[in-house]
């Protein structure tokens, strides 16, 4: 998994008038990291782990940078012609990655009312746009605006690749997010389903990184996909992730079933409890 930094900036217009507020969300290694609120922009770490990465001293820098980016995007929205009445949004998503071989990737994507209309590879400076005529009209409009100010294009948009990577490296230097591994807590529960059946649910929480294998086994053999129901792997707000898998089994056959978990090269097996709840910490 590469390390990544993702900026998601959103600005709004109402009846053609660009609103003063904006929203910025920043994700570090896929985790919600910072949030810059609409009216007053203050970078807020999402949970203790973000505070550990940033430290109080650097909040001003993030606030200043994000405010500047928000202003730039508002100006871009103001130059989009033919805005219809009502509420409209312009979103810019910027992503940079550092891979294990130290290679880098950077890209920038623009969305209007949630629809992608323009992308740029920030390394090659190549622009791409969808085929639809609406998207192409928007794309030409925005590209022309960005090209109007050649200095701005050079110093701001093409510098974003370097800036994003610089910020990512700065966060990684804190050591908090450097290839850490946090094992999951695995929790198996059972609940009555229909007559003669029970639903067994296996939850894994508090793990990092997000890649995990979680599945139900019968006699040691993985159940087929169509007999299991999986939850998404979601951030839990603490810099770690959570997910679950459930299946329905015949009452009295619990001893044949186990929840199998594999994470970061380690694994564990968890039986169905005879009572209501069984919580097990994976000890590696």
């Amino acid at each position: 998994e590469p390390h990544s930094l993702r900026y998601n900036l959103t600005v709004l217009s109402w009846d053609g008038s660009v609103q003063s507020g904006f929203l910025t969300e920043v994700h570090l290694d896929g985790q919600p990291f910072l949030r810059c609120d609409r009216q007053k922009c203050r970078a807020k770490p999402q949970g203790q782990w973000a505070e550990d990465v940033l430290g109080n001293k650097t909040w001003d820098r993030e606030t200043r940078d994000l405010t500047g980016n928000g202003k730039d995007l508002r100006m871009t929205l103001a130059h989009i012609k033919d805005q219809k009445e009502g509420l409209h949004s312009l979103q810019e998503i910027r992503v940079c990655e550092i891979h294990e071989d130290n290679s880098t990737r950077s890209s920038q994507h623009f969305y209007y009312d949630g629809e992608l209309f323009l992308s740029q590879n920030l390394e090659t400076k190549e622009w791409t746009m969808p085929q639809s005529s609406r998207a192409q009209t928007l794309a030409m409009n925005v590209r022309n605006f960005l090209k109007e100010d050649a200095m701005k294009t050079k110093t701001h948009y093409h510098a974003m690749h370097a800036d994003c990577l610089q910020e990512l490296r700065r966060y990684l230097k804190s050591g908090v997010v450097l290839r850490r591994t946090v094992p999951p807590m695995v929790n198996v529960t059972r609940s009555e389903a229909s007559e003669g059946n029970i639903t067994v649910t296996c939850r894994a929480s508090g793990f990092y990184p997000w890649n995990i294998t979680l599945s139900w086994r019968q006699d040691g053999v993985s159940l087929s996909h169509d007999t299991q129901q999986w939850g998404d792997v979601l951030p839990d707000g603490n810099g770690t992730y959570q997910t679950w898998v459930a299946t329905r089994i015949c009452q009295g056959e619990e001893q044949r079933f186990t929840c199998y978990m594999e994470h970061s090269g380690n694994h564990s097996t968890h039986p169905v409890p005879s009572g209501k709840v069984l919580v097990l910490q994976s000890h590696w």
């Epitope: 086994r217 006699d219 040691g220 053999v221 087929s224 001893q255 097996t269």
Partner: antibody, heavy 118, light 108 residues
Framework: EIQLVQSGAEVKKPGSSVKVSCKPS????????IYWVRQAPGQGLEWIGY????????IYNQQFKDRATLTVDKSTSTAYMELSSLRSEDTAVYYC???????????WGQGTLVTVSS | EIVLTQSPATLSLSPGERATLSCSAS???????LHWYQQKPGQAPRLLIY???NLASGIPARFSGSGSGTDFTLTISSLEPEDFAVYYC?????????FGQGTKVEIK
């Protein structure tokens, strides 16, 4: 490469016990169940039971419950099957096998011939 | 206990011919729990087909499986010399896990 290596052939007297070992390699020992199956000369396959090496859970074929004992030694990544009160009809090749992702027996040991004779 | 009955007990065929082996279960089995194994003299069985119709790793495409409920079939489209062996079906749906008594495919 995944392999399961079993202990050598045994000749036993009726009423005695035999303990067959199975040492898997090429995968994490505790990640898959170890099954035991036997095959009498010229006969079909008969499932004895399995053990989950991670939690130590054992499921036996009721037919063998009173005489078979399945164990594992996690420190040496070895599984064992002990059969007691041997009789002549226990003469068979005993196989260990690994549970697979999609089937009960995806890799097999080479087999251990146990001969019960007075 | 689910009893698996294989037929025929012996199948005498020549290389290049088609082999059809049957496995009949005493109770209905989900297709996810029916597997086939091949065993040659002096060797351990090896997984051939899992979950009724899926080829195990390294198994040639001339082998195929089908069926549902209580009736399952293993087909070898064109027998090769190395295919002459004993074939077992096995169910993993309910305990005890059981095997069929085997079908021997021999050279005619």
């Amino acid at each position: 490469e995944i392999q399961l290596v079993q202990s050598g052939a045994e000749v036993k007297k009726p009423g005695s016990s035999v303990k067959v070992s199975c040492k898997p390699s090429g995968y994490a020992f505790t990640s898959n169940n170890i099954y035991w199956v036997r095959q009498a000369p010229g006969q079909g396959l008969e499932w004895i039971g399995y053990i989950d090496p991670y939690i130590g859970r054992i499921i036996y074929n009721q037919q063998f419950k009173d005489r078979a004992t399945l164990t594992v030694d996690k420190s040496t990544s070895t599984a064992y099957m002990e059969l007691s009160s041997l009789r002549s009809e226990d003469t068979a090749v005993y196989y260990c096998s690994r549970s697979g992702e999609r089937s009960n027996f995806d890799y097999w040991g080479q087999g251990t011939l146990v001969t019960v004779s007075s | 206990e689910i009893v698996l009955t294989q037929s025929p007990a012996t199948l005498s065929l020549s290389p290049g011919e088609r082999a059809t082996l049957s496995c009949s279960a005493s109770s209905s089995i989900s297709s996810n729990y029916l597997h086939w194994y091949q065993q040659k003299p002096g060797q351990a069985p090896r997984l051939l087909i899992y979950r009724t119709s899926n080829l195990a790793s390294g198994i040639p495409a001339r082998f195929s499986g089908s069926g549902s409920g209580t009736d399952f079939t293993l087909t070898i489209s064109s027998l090769e010399p190395e295919d002459f062996a004993v074939y077992y079906c096995q169910q993993g749906g309910s305990l005890p896990l059981t095997f069929g008594q085997g079908t021997k495919v021999e050279i005619k």
